[in-house]
């Protein structure tokens, strides 16, 4: 039986141009975690193996870094970003837990501080 | 240039063990993952295992779990491969290979080893 | 097990035609696919990874799709040094696999 619950930050916001960390953990359970897989709506970012380590799919390799732990760092932020992320724990001998994040990139407050007292 | 250089043929028992090297060279041993690919005459590939160097971290395909072991010497860049038991079944090229940074893909590959199991 | 299957052992193509080779995944392994090119004699060569991006090296007519279950390998414009055994590999769980080979041969 499944007994696991899987705790992420849940809905998050960062700035265009930033960075953030997207975390998930696995608890209530005494299942191995032999893999985490990381993905956004039908696309792979990284996999993180127990063993084997880090893979992180070439189209976000120069803008994701591994970790930290099991999480993963998605950084030079930009609107097209924002959507729904995935944690997939696959554990043994329960089998696969997953977790949802939402993540909304926003224009800085710089850009926005600029835009509203702008000079005619 | 990165080069596995895998050791020669071996011709073996039935029962017997094998243990075969490969050295890598042209890149640091130990941020890179060594697998071991299985190829029986004619037929496809089967992974069997992977080492990560770096963390000791050893992943098996359960079907060769009991029988092979997966080891390296970082000092000489050497991954090695046991396969004890053998049967006619293990008769096969015998393949390392490994990715490149941070991908899962096998970009490299050594030469092969041949191994024959027969009385 | 994840098993990939390739559903043409064979196919025979001539020079400069467009032949796709495909690959099912038994269950859903995202992106996380490679293809490899074997030649009679020799080790297998990385052409495309992740699944649609080109190797160092390997020539532009070497084409690669899919995500999710289905993924195809495509060569736009065959040439006779083509001539060899396509794999398809996953490895988005272990035990990662391999499909079982497609055999291209020339006319």
């Known amino acids: 039986m499944m007994t696991g619950t899987i705790e992420t930050t849940g809905n998050i916001s960062a700035e265009k141009g930033g960075s953030i960390i997207l975390q998930c953990h696995l608890s209530s359970t005494t299942a191995q975690v032999t893999q985490v897989n990381w993905e956004q709506q039908d696309q792979l970012l990284a996999i993180c193996n127990a063993d084997l380590g880090w893979h992180i799919s070439p189209s976000f390799k120069d803008r994701v870094a591994p970790g930290p732990g099991l999480g993963l760092t998605l950084q030079s932020l930009t609107v097209n970003d924002t959507g729904e992320y995935f944690c997939i724990y696959h554990t043994y001998p329960d089998g696969t837990y997953t977790g949802r994040i939402f993540l909304e990139v926003l224009e800085s407050s710089v850009a926005e501080h600029g835009a509203r007292f702008q000079i005619p | 240039e990165v080069q596995l250089q895998q050791s020669g043929p071996e011709l073996v028992k039935p029962g017997a063990s094998v243990k075969i090297s490969c050295k890598t060279s042209?890149?640091?041993?130990?941020?890179?993952?060594m697998h071991w690919v299985k190829q029986s005459h004619g037929k496809s590939l089967e992974w069997i295992g992977g080492?990560?160097?770096?963390?000791?971290?050893?992943s098996y395909n359960q079907r060769f779990k009991d029988r092979a072991t997966l080891t390296v010497d970082k000092s000489s860049s050497t991954a090695y491969m046991e396969l004890r038991s053998l049967t006619s079944e293990d008769s096969a090229v015998y393949y390392c290979?490994?990715?490149?940074?941070?991908?899962?893909?096998?970009?490299?590959w050594g030469q092969g080893t041949l191994v024959t199991v027969s009385a | 097990d994840i098993v990939m299957t390739q559903s043409h052992k064979f196919m025979s193509t001539s020079v400069g035609d467009r032949v796709s080779i495909t690959c099912k995944a038994s269950?859903?392994?995202?992106?996380?696919v490679a293809w490899y090119q074997q030649k009679p004699g020799q080790s297998p060569k990385l052409l495309i990874y992740?699944?649609?991006y080109r190797y160092t090296g390997v020539p532009d007519r070497f084409t690669g799709s899919g995500s999710g279950t289905d993924f195809t390998f495509t060569i736009s414009s065959v040439q006779a040094e083509d001539l060899a055994v396509y794999y398809c590999?996953?490895?988005?769980?272990?035990?990662?696999?391999f499909g079982g080979g497609t055999k291209l041969e020339i006319k």
């Open positions: 992740s699944p649609s």
């Open positions: 042209g890149s640091t041993f130990t941020e890179y993952t």
């Open positions: 269950h859903y392994v995202s992106t996380a």
């Open positions: 590999h996953q490895h988005y769980s272990t035990p990662w696999t």
């Open positions: 290979t490994r990715g490149t940074y941070y991908d899962y893909s096998f970009a490299y």
């Open positions: 080492l990560n160097p770096n963390n000791g971290g050893t």
